[in-house]
Interface confidence: medium
């Protein structure tokens, strides 16, 4: 996983990573949907 997020606590880091993972999944689905629609 990426280390590129500033944080001062591991729990905050973990939460930011979870958000990042979620956004990647959502954006990935949207991209796949757009390709499908084409």
């Amino acid at each position: 996983h990426s280390d590129g997020i500033f944080t001062d606590s591991y729990s905050r880091y973990r939460k930011q990573m979870a958000v990042k993972k979620y956004l990647a999944a959502v954006l990935g689905k949207r991209y796949k949907q757009r390709v499908k629609n084409k």
Partner: antibody, heavy 121, light 111 residues
């Protein structure tokens, strides 16, 4: 097979320094966050330090902050703990542990056998 | 810091009987629907061994007589049918807030 082997423990005088090492094998070391956990004789477990897979971020409890430094060399599959200004209360078995990949839950799924640090004059 | 209080300190259970260990946190260890509570088993002279993560998920290779439950501040580790090899000290650990903290341990013995 995942293996973690600690070394570098020993007897040191109060105020002295020691560097612990942990050799990792059997997994993609750079993909995992790693920790050090210690256990004083006859006592429970205490978290000492954590480092991210790429080594960019580190965390410590107040009890060791400013005295201990966790680091890693991913090219050598090795984890380190530099311990300075050692105190009698730092006497413990020090374990190297791998964090699970489960959404950074903080659980540690593989542990080494530990290395003993004794701080005494 | 989040303080984890385990009870009882020690427990003697007959072979085949149920063993229940409690872990109470001084504040919630939940975040976004997940509980950041872990359970470990430690036998004499050995390092801790991961049993359960995220309060109720059994780690791979752990017998299903072990189970975890709870959320918020109250958690339980249950051994449904105690076996001789389960004699050990059991620790809970939270990782929702820094610093990560462990409970004081519960020693499980055979009655």
């Amino acid at each position: 097979e995942v293996q973690l082997v600690e070394s570098g423990g020993g007897l040191v005088k109060p105020g002295g320094s020691l560097r612990l090492s942990c050799a990792a094998s059997g997994f993609a070391f750079n993909n995992y966050d790693m920790s050090w956990v210690r256990q004083a004789p006859g006592k429970g477990l205490e978290w000492v330090a954590t480092i991210t897979g790429g080594g960019s971020y580190t965390w410590y409890p107040d009890s060791v902050k400013g005295r201990f430094t966790i680091s890693r060399d991913n090219a050598k599959n090795s984890l380190y703990l530099q311990m300075n200004s050692l105190r009698a209360e730092d006497t413990a078995v020090y374990y190297c542990a791998r964090l699970t990949g489960y959404d950074q839950a903080g659980a540690m799924d593989y542990w080494g056998q530990g290395t003993t640090v004794t701080v005494s004059s | 810091d989040i303080v984890l209080t385990q009870s009882p300190d020690s427990l003697a259970v007959s072979l085949g009987e149920r063993a229940t260990i409690n872990c109470k946190a001084s504040q919630s260890v939940d975040y976004d629907g997940d509980s950041y509570m872990t359970w470990y088993q430690q036998k004499p002279g050995q390092p801790p061994k991961l049993l359960i993560y995220a309060a109720s998920n059994l780690d791979s290779g752990i017998p299903d007589r072990f189970s975890g439950s709870g959320s918020g501040t109250d958690f339980t580790l249950t051994i449904s049918s105690l076996q001789a090899e389960d004699v050990a000290v059991y620790y809970c650990q939270q990782s929702n807030e820094d610093p990560w903290t462990f409970g004081g341990g519960t020693k499980v013995e055979i009655k």
